[in-house]
Interface confidence: low
């Protein structure tokens, strides 16, 4: 068990703060909830603290919760491939470029680390080149979320990881908006981190609303499990 992994044996409170600017539309989001890495479970509620969110909530799910991939459930035989927990408590920097097909792109930078007993994800997001009447700024996405696989590989040069995946957002007319994600994570601290073999995270997310919440918001339930590395031969013959 990595030293960081010991911090995730129970339920951990989560705080998410985002400052965003998409095509000049500026906004802030605050999120709170908890994560339980034993089950790979996240429960979070996000509120736009600046009024109405200028982009659809589903376009921010990867920035919020795929940002705290330290809550992913890594099976026993894969624990030596869990970069995310190994970087804690100092945390990691996570940067992404997200290309929305035939539309604009988001660039994000986040610091994910423990502040006291709370896991904090502080994010800056900049979006450019979006069409004002496109699927994103035109709010044409359905309020739901598909399951995805998130592909992880070591980046030995930067003592971190590179991550690639493609998100499929459902559009109200029945078509799909693709969003290509290019991600890199680097540790904030100087301590040793686990550099993984290639594997993936399998994600399932459910979006809902709080009937008592008047502000623009999103409630998120997510389960994430690591997969893609089989038991070694020594395991088979135990």
């Amino acid at each position: 068990m990595s030293k960081g992994e010991e911090l995730f044996t129970g339920v951990v409170p989560i705080l998410v703060e985002l400052d965003g600017d998409v095509n000049g539309h500026k906004f802030s989001v605050s999120g709170e909830g908890e994560g339980d890495a034993t089950y790979g479970k996240l429960t979070l509620k996000f509120i736009c603290t600046t009024g109405k969110l200028p982009v659809p909530w589903p376009t921010l799910v990867t920035t919020f919760s795929y940002g705290v991939q330290c809550f992913s459930r890594y099976p026993d035989h894969m624990k030596q491939h869990d970069f995310f927990k190994s970087a804690m408590p100092e945390g990691y920097v996570q940067e992404r470029t997200i290309f929305f097909k035939d539309d604009g792109n988001y660039k994000t930078r986040a610091e994910v680390k423990f502040e006291g007993d709370t896991l904090v994800n502080r994010i800056e997001l900049k979006g450019i080149d979006f069409k004002e009447d496109g699927n994103i700024l035109g709010h044409k996405l359905e309020y739901n979320y598909n399951s995805h696989n998130v592909y992880i590989m070591a980046d030995k040069q930067k003592n971190g990881i590179k991550v690639n995946f493609k998100i499929r957002h459902n559009i109200e007319d029945g078509s799909v908006q693709l969003a290509d994600h290019y991600q890199q994570n680097t540790p904030i601290g100087d301590g040793p981190v686990l550099l993984p073999d290639n594997h993936y995270l399998s994600t399932q997310s459910a979006l809902s609303k709080d009937p008592n919440e008047k502000r623009d918001h999103m409630v998120l339930l997510e389960f994430v499990t690591a997969a893609g590395i089989t038991h070694g031969m020594d395991e088979l013959y135990k």
Epitope: K107, R109, K126
Partner: nanobody, 121 residues
Framework: ESGGGSVQAGGSLRLSCAAS????????MAWFRQAPGKEREGVAA????????YYADSVKGRFTISQDNAKNTVYLQMNSLEPEDTSIYYC???????????????????WGQGTQVTVSS
């Protein structure tokens, strides 16, 4: 921007960027440079709120970025200049905190007109 000019290798220059219509006390201020035929590259950045600084590997230990909130000005002190530092230097500002590794010019909302720095051997 001001403070550019010509200097011998090993010399020093101090660039200044006075922001008008923009308050440097929050967000990110940065210096970029662009040599002829090359991509614009991030040199240094400072988070105005807490003073955290970031530097490109090529200038670490030689360049220092600083700010004076009272004068709404950001500085780039350049020491031990090398011919490879010859470029047009641009000041940039963002309302958001600095990106960790200076990668993206699109992060910044405001840009200066640039000042030429020439270092001869």
């Amino acid at each position: 921007e001001s403070g550019g000019g010509s200097v011998q290798a090993g010399g020093s220059l101090r660039l200044s960027c006075a922001a008008s219509g923009y308050t440097v006390s929050r967000g990110c201020m940065a210096w970029f440079r662009q040599a002829p035929g090359k991509e614009r590259e991030g040199v240094a950045a400072i988070n105005s709120g807490d003073g955290t600084t970031y530097y490109a590997d090529s200038v670490k230990g030689r360049f220092t970025i600083s700010q004076d909130n009272a004068k709404n000005t950001v500085y780039l002190q350049m020491n031990s200049l090398e011919p490879e530092d010859t470029s047009i230097y641009y000041c940039a500002a963002s309302r958001l905190r600095c990106p960790w590794n200076l990668v993206s010019a699109s992060w910044y909302d405001f840009w200066g007109q640039g000042t030429q720095v020439t270092v001869s051997s």
